[in-house]
């Protein structure tokens, strides 16, 4: 049986939130006697911050839950719980295990465009042309789902001419042409782009929007019969 368990829970969760389950096995009979009935308890918590009762364990299932508010990833990113499993339903032999609880960064910061307005120039008929890179800042953990940006063109792209992807390292939004633009048909497009995260927000946060004015540049085209 494993004697070190690892689990995780988001910072700031409400008391009652389940974290993980630990299990101890006992070969003794648990049907006709209590010899094989295991009872779980938390013997100690380290660190004891903000206080020493941040977690509780279900006596019979071994499910560890948050019992107090105040989990703060910046302050304490990992807790060590010493778990006791005692057979005879709590009156017999005891064994100990360790549960390491990682406190995860909650998505409590929205990505924000900086700047919020862009102007770009694109030659007509160019497909796959990089129009503009959009920059966002996010105070959540870098490279985590709470930080990684997801971009969506909310308006202005009636002809489905544009697409936007996220750069995996810089987190910038890369706006490119999906199909060629026609200067003669429309020489300017005003796009509205919204940014969110891969992970859902844990509270109601304002969504940042950027405006991109795309000027289509005329290209001399050969006459057509």
């Amino acid at each position: 049986t494993q004697d070190t368990f690892r689990g995780s829970v988001l910072e700031g969760v409400l008391p009652g939130t389940s974290v993980m389950q630990v299990t101890a096995t006992d070969e003794d009979d648990a049907i006709y006697t209590y010899n094989g009935v295991v009872a779980y308890s938390i013997h100690s918590q380290e660190p004891k911050d903000p206080h020493d009762l941040m977690f509780t364990i279900h006596r019979s299932t071994g499910t560890i839950s948050v019992i107090s508010s105040g989990l703060d990833r910046e302050k304490v990113p990992e807790y060590t719980l010493t778990i006791q499993a005692t057979d005879m339903d709590g009156d017999g032999s005891t064994t100990t295990a360790v549960a390491v609880v990682e406190i995860l960064d909650a998505n409590d910061n929205a990505p924000m465009f900086d700047p919020q307005k862009y102007e770009a120039h694109v030659p007509e008929n160019a497909v796959g042309h990089e129009v503009q890179r959009l920059t966002v800042t996010d105070l959540d953990a870098p490279n985590s789902p709470a930080w990684r940006a997801t971009y969506l063109i909310m308006g202005g792209d009636d002809g489905d001419h544009f697409t936007i992807t996220t750069h995996p390292e810089s987190n910038q939004g890369i706006l490119t042409t999906r199909k060629g633009l026609d200067f003669e048909a429309k020489n300017q497009h005003t796009l509205y782009v919204e940014v969110t995260n891969e992970a859902p927000f844990v509270l109601k946060l304002p969504t940042s929007t950027a405006t991109i004015v795309v000027h289509v540049e005329d290209v001399n085209e050969a006459p057509v019969f």
Partner: antibody, heavy 123, light 113 residues
């Protein structure tokens, strides 16, 4: 350039306390946790504890009762205080930076180490 | 606490040879949620501080020569130096960061013939 540097007393009498200061430069203590590790003469490495970016600490349970790690972010300094020293606490004491503040950084791995300060416990 | 056992305690090789050293953990360092092994390798040259070589059991730290390779999963790990150089004379330590307290192996001393 990331720099980590320790300063300590050198010689400590048995039953007395030890205070070591770790001064860092090139990075902020609000972004990186700092670990303390010691190495007795001719022996291996022993992890003592860590102070996280927000000031929380985790200690080696065997030393927890006589160990305190604290810091001053504005001065870029981390402090180790150990009480009731005995001769087997004689060692070189290192402070070492965690790779980052997040689990996915591999924060348990230590990427920058000071040169260490030698502490001898003797009367 | 988790016990880390390294072997051999010392070995002597000639320049250019391939060398492997072992690190065993008293229990698995593989976390199922992210499929990562919480293990690091360090190099400590005589009179110097330890230097991080490998983390996540196999990820080479920036600036570490590619002759150093970490491998393994669960409880059994290996550090390989593909072609030893004279400057590799050092003690090599493994360290687990799966559980507190973090613990180090006893070290493998690499000597050059």
């Amino acid at each position: 350039v990331q720099l980590v540097e320790e300063s300590g007393p050198g010689l400590v009498a048995p039953s007395q306390s030890l205070s070591i200061t770790c001064t860092v430069s090139g990075f902020s203590l609000t972004s990186y946790p700092i670990n303390w590790v010691r190495q007795p003469p001719g022996k291996g490495l022993e992890w003592l504890g860590v102070i996280w970016t927000g000031g929380g600490t985790n200690y080696d349970s065997a030393l927890k009762s006589r160990l305190t790690i604290s810091k001053d972010n504005s001065k870029s300094q981390v402090f180790l205080k150990m009480n009731s020293l005995q001769t087997d606490d004689t060692a070189r004491y290192y402070c070492a930076r965690s790779r980052g503040a997040y689990d996915f950084d591999g924060r348990g791995a230590m990427d920058y180490w000071g040169q260490g300060t030698t502490v001898t416990v003797s009367s | 606490e988790l016990v880390m056992t390294q072997s051999p305690s010392s070995l002597a090789v000639s320049v250019g040879e391939k060398v492997t050293m072992s690190c065993k953990s008293s229990q698995s360092l593989l976390y199922s949620s992210n499929q990562k092994n919480y293990l690091a390798w360090y190099q400590q040259k005589p009179g110097q501080s330890p230097k991080l070589l490998i983390y996540w059991a196999s990820t080479r730290e920036s600036g570490v020569p590619d002759r150093f390779t970490g491998s393994g999963s669960g409880t059994d790990f290996t550090l390989t130096i593909s072609s030893v150089k004279a400057e590799d004379l050092a003690v090599y330590y493994c360290q687990q960061y799966y559980s507190y307290p973090y613990t180090f192996g006893g070290g493998t001393k690499l000597e050059i013939k």
